[in-house]
């Protein structure tokens, strides 16, 4: 088998053996090493020597195998844009941000750049659960049977109706999508508005 080429090596077809860790340098028609994450090109390659990589300075990073001559500046999560930090910047990874609680991502350019307040879901509905929190605005769905939600809120969940019998009580009024079951002591008289119903 042929010996493996070690950068720098000539490439006539403008492609390199390891596309992730090497790059084609067109001026000299050679393949050179990329710099690993967390580093940058301190000295470019030539026909007789490979790329020299240096570690990114504090508060800067490069996330991928690269041939960049600088590291990217770490940027804080902008609270004015509704963002909060979930992981700090390292030499190998930018600051990880997410939308603050009660907000969703309204502008996306490779990453979230702007969050807005989630819409309220009216009584009788709740926000449909999403795979990723903060990814989109609320989509309100009706409470399923036997559940209710009685506020206008972006985050309130539909709760199961109270089962009066579990508390040794009896149902005075059935629950709806917007209200809980009303329970009463079995010995208590019916409220006036219910008396007609009971007579029937």
């Amino acid at each position: 088998s042929q010996p493996q080429a070690v950068p720098p090596y000539a490439s006539e077809n403008q492609t390199c053996r390891d596309q992730e860790k090497e790059y084609y340098e067109p001026q000299h028609r050679i393949c050179c090493s990329r710099c690993p994450p967390g580093t940058y090109v301190s000295a470019k390659c030539s026909r007789i020597r490979d790329t020299v990589c240096a570690t990114c300075a504090e508060n800067s990073y490069n996330e991928h195998w690269n041939y960049l001559t600088i590291c990217q500046l770490c940027r804080p999560c902008d609270p004015v844009m509704g963002l909060e930090e979930i992981a700090p910047c390292t030499s190998k990874r930018k600051t990880q941000c997410r939308c603050q609680p009660g907000m969703f991502c309204a502008a996306w350019a490779l990453e979230c750049t702007h969050c807005e307040l989630l819409s309220d879901c009216p009584p009788g509905t709740e926000a449909e659960l999403k795979d990723e929190v903060g990814k989109g605005n609320n989509h309100c769905v009706p409470c399923k049977a036997g559940h209710f939600q009685n506020t206008s809120s972006p985050s309130a969940r539909c709760q199961p109706h109270t089962r009066c019998e579990n508390q040794g009580l009896v149902e005075a009024a059935p629950g709806t999508a917007q209200s809980d079951t009303t329970c009463k002591n079995p010995l208590e008289p019916l409220p006036p508005e219910m008396s007609g119903t009971m007579l029937m």
Partner: antibody
Framework: QVQLQESGPGQVKPSQTLSLTCTVS??????????WGWIRQHPGKGLEWIGY???????YYNPSLKSRTTISVDTSKNQFSLKLSSVIAADTAVYYC???????????????WGQGTMVTVSS | EIVLTQSPGTLSLSPGERASLSCWSS???????LAWYHQKPGQAPRLLIY???TRATGIPDRFSGSGSGTDFTLSISRLEPEDFAVYYC?????????FGQGTRLEIK
């Protein structure tokens, strides 16, 4: 601007080690886009590349001298050094330190040189 | 290793004349990696041209470089008194870096 200055003994005995230091002034040896090298010139003759190094490490040597050559960097002193072991009379030469510009914005020629120091190998 | 041969060994010209110095390589080299230097007695070499044709900082435009492959030329359009020196070509296309043996440019 950047200046280079060689220093070291002017005479070395045969079989001993020649040690020279180059001090960089007017700029940092750690600035990045440079290799720091040694070139020698035998009396009345042409130039011979010995080797060079980047501040991070990565020395490169002339194969004809590689077994006897060590080039190192001391960033705290802004210096780089040459050690040539087991010297013989044929190592008598003017030794120059020089900067090889290897940044993305320039080519790999020796753009700045020290004034040179004569080293005689003699008992 | 790549051997660089310079011609002529000595060139005798007068100030104001044009000088043409040749450098031949034993193997084809990328013109990106050819440089020219001059050296005056008792001084270090000084970079004149890199990349075969690009003048180094501070070098007057009477100096020009050309060529490719194995044949390179340094031209000085109008010789000034300070141009009389030894001229070296250098390649850094292949390890080890090598220099030509030099051309001595002397006043006629």
């Amino acid at each position: 601007q950047v200046q280079l200055q060689e220093s070291g003994p002017g005479q070395v005995k045969p079989s001993q080690t020649l040690s020279l230091t180059c001090t960089v002034s007017g700029g940092s040896i750690s600035s990045g886009g440079y290799f720091w090298g040694w070139i020698r010139q035998h009396p009345g003759k042409g130039l011979e590349w010995i080797g060079y190094i980047h501040y991070i490490g990565s020395p490169y040597y002339n194969p004809s001298l590689k077994s006897r050559t060590t080039i190192s960097v001391d960033t705290s002193k802004n210096q780089f050094s040459l050690k040539l072991s087991s010297v013989i009379a044929a190592d008598t030469a003017v030794y120059y330190c020089a900067r090889d510009c290897s940044s993305v914005n320039c080519q790999d020629a020796f753009d700045i040189w020290g004034q040179g120091t004569m080293v005689t190998v003699s008992s | 290793e790549i051997v660089l041969t310079q011609s002529p060994g000595t060139l005798s010209l007068s100030p104001g004349e044009r000088a043409s110095l040749s450098c031949w390589s034993s193997q084809s080299i990328d013109s990106t990696y050819l440089a020219w230097y001059h050296q005056k007695p008792g001084q270090a070499p000084r970079l004149l041209i890199y990349g075969a044709s690009t003048r180094a900082t501070g070098i007057p435009d009477r100096f020009s470089g050309s060529g490719s492959g194995t044949d390179f030329t340094l031209s000085i359009s109008r010789l000034e008194p300070e141009d009389f020196a030894v001229y070296y070509c250098q390649q850094y296309s292949s390890s080890p870096i090598t220099f030509g043996q030099g051309t001595r440019l002397e006043i006629k």
